[in-house]
Interface confidence: low
């Protein structure tokens, strides 16, 4: 039974050329984390690998960088990063959790960033 | 060459503030996480805060409410506001580079800066 | 603050293989990398290993890291004195949000 549940940071929004934290937590739940996968729509950002450790997309290398933590980086960026970002943790024996963020990404210079993760 | 030097440092009584510094020159500043790690006398190292690139501050649950991380991109300096000092706060304080990959570690360190938390 | 887990205190001859231990937990060096540093007496620490087991330019090749688990190793071949120092392991901690270290391992050189 997947008792776990995944905490983002939710929406969020940045500056057309800084940078963000995208971050997801797995709480509630005992299971291992093998692997998490980083994807916007449906393309794969990055992953990271509890044994391998970090692998970022070759299309993406030069404007994302792996962490905080199990976290990713956003950086130099653009208007069309704005869109929806997915953390998949694979788990053993749970099974795979999905978390959600929306990031927008504003012209203006007066973008407010999101609320900061805090882990309680 | 990757040079950081932290100031500020001194004797102060409980319940008082300090504010650190960290000069840094040699590489790109503001491109880098940093943070602050302090080892008390004859103690092993306790990292006190981090600040990333993107602003995001990350503390030690012993010092979360009492101390503030901030940088200077324009000075390429880092400072640690320390407020509501204790005995248990007395350490040599480090100001310490992260990789450029964040979790590979800190790997340019100061000399370290002594704050002394005494009445 | 939960750490990791290090033995206080590690010896050998010169010319010896010694080893030193970093356990932590599934939050920390399961899914992170370690780092270890050696800290001289009377100096700041120095990177020795990052990413589990590479050495930055300049550490002897002596020097080298594993990680299993949740267990990490710092092993020292060819003991020279020179290497009586402080050693601490380091890590991300998921849970935490933070850096957490280990309480550092002294090693003598009999």
């Known amino acids: 039974m997947m008792t776990g549940t995944i905490e983002t940071t939710g929406n969020i929004s940045a500056e057309k050329g800084g940078s963000i934290i995208l971050q997801c937590h797995l709480s509630s739940t005992t299971a291992q984390v093998t692997q998490v996968n980083w994807e916007q729509q449906d393309q794969l950002l990055a992953i990271c690998n509890a044994d391998l450790g970090w692998h970022i997309s070759p299309s993406f290398k030069d404007r994302v960088a792996p962490g905080p933590g199990l976290g990713l980086t956003l950086q130099s960026l653009t208007v069309n990063d704005t869109g929806e970002y997915f953390c998949i943790y694979h788990t053993y024996p749970d099974g795979t959790y999905t978390g959600r963020i929306f990031l927008e990404v504003l012209e203006s210079s007066v973008a407010e960033h999101g609320a900061r993760f805090q882990i309680p | 060459e990757v040079q950081l030097l932290e100031s500020g440092g001194g004797l102060v009584q409980p319940g008082g503030s300090l504010r650190l510094s960290c000069a840094t020159s040699?590489?790109?500043?503001?491109?880098?996480?940093m943070s602050w790690v302090r080892q008390a006398p004859g103690k092993g190292l306790e990292w006190v805060s981090g600040?990333?690139?993107?602003?995001?501050?990350y503390y030690a649950d012993s010092v979360k409410g009492r101390f503030t991380i901030s940088r200077d991109n324009s000075k390429n300096t880092l400072y640690l506001q320390m407020n509501s000092l204790r005995a248990e706060d007395t350490a040599v304080y480090y100001c310490?580079?992260?990789?450029?990959?964040?979790?590979?570690?800190?790997?340019?360190w100061g000399q370290g800066t002594t704050v002394t938390v005494s009445s | 603050q939960s750490g990791l887990t290090q033995p206080p205190s590690a010896s050998g001859t010169p010319g010896q293989r010694v080893t030193i231990s970093c356990s932590g937990d599934?939050?920390?060096?399961?899914?992170?990398?370690v780092s270890w540093y050696q800290q001289l007496p009377g100096t700041a620490p120095k990177l020795l290993i990052y990413?589990?087991?590479q050495r930055p330019s300049g550490v002897p090749d002596r020097f080298s890291g594993s990680k299993s688990a949740t267990s990490a190793s710092l092993a020292i071949s060819g003991l020279q004195s020179e290497d009586e120092a402080d050693y601490h392991c380091?890590?991300?901690?998921?849970?935490?949000?933070?850096?957490?270290f280990g309480g550092g391992t002294k090693l003598t050189v009999l």
């Open positions: 310490a580079k992260g990789h450029t990959v964040l979790q590979y570690g800190m790997d340019v």
């Open positions: 040699g590489f790109t500043f503001s491109s880098y996480w």
């Open positions: 600040i990333h690139i993107s602003d995001s501050t």
């Open positions: 599934i939050s920390n060096t399961r899914n992170n990398y």
């Open positions: 990413g589990n087991h």
């Open positions: 380091g890590t991300w901690d998921n849970t935490l949000n933070a850096w957490v």
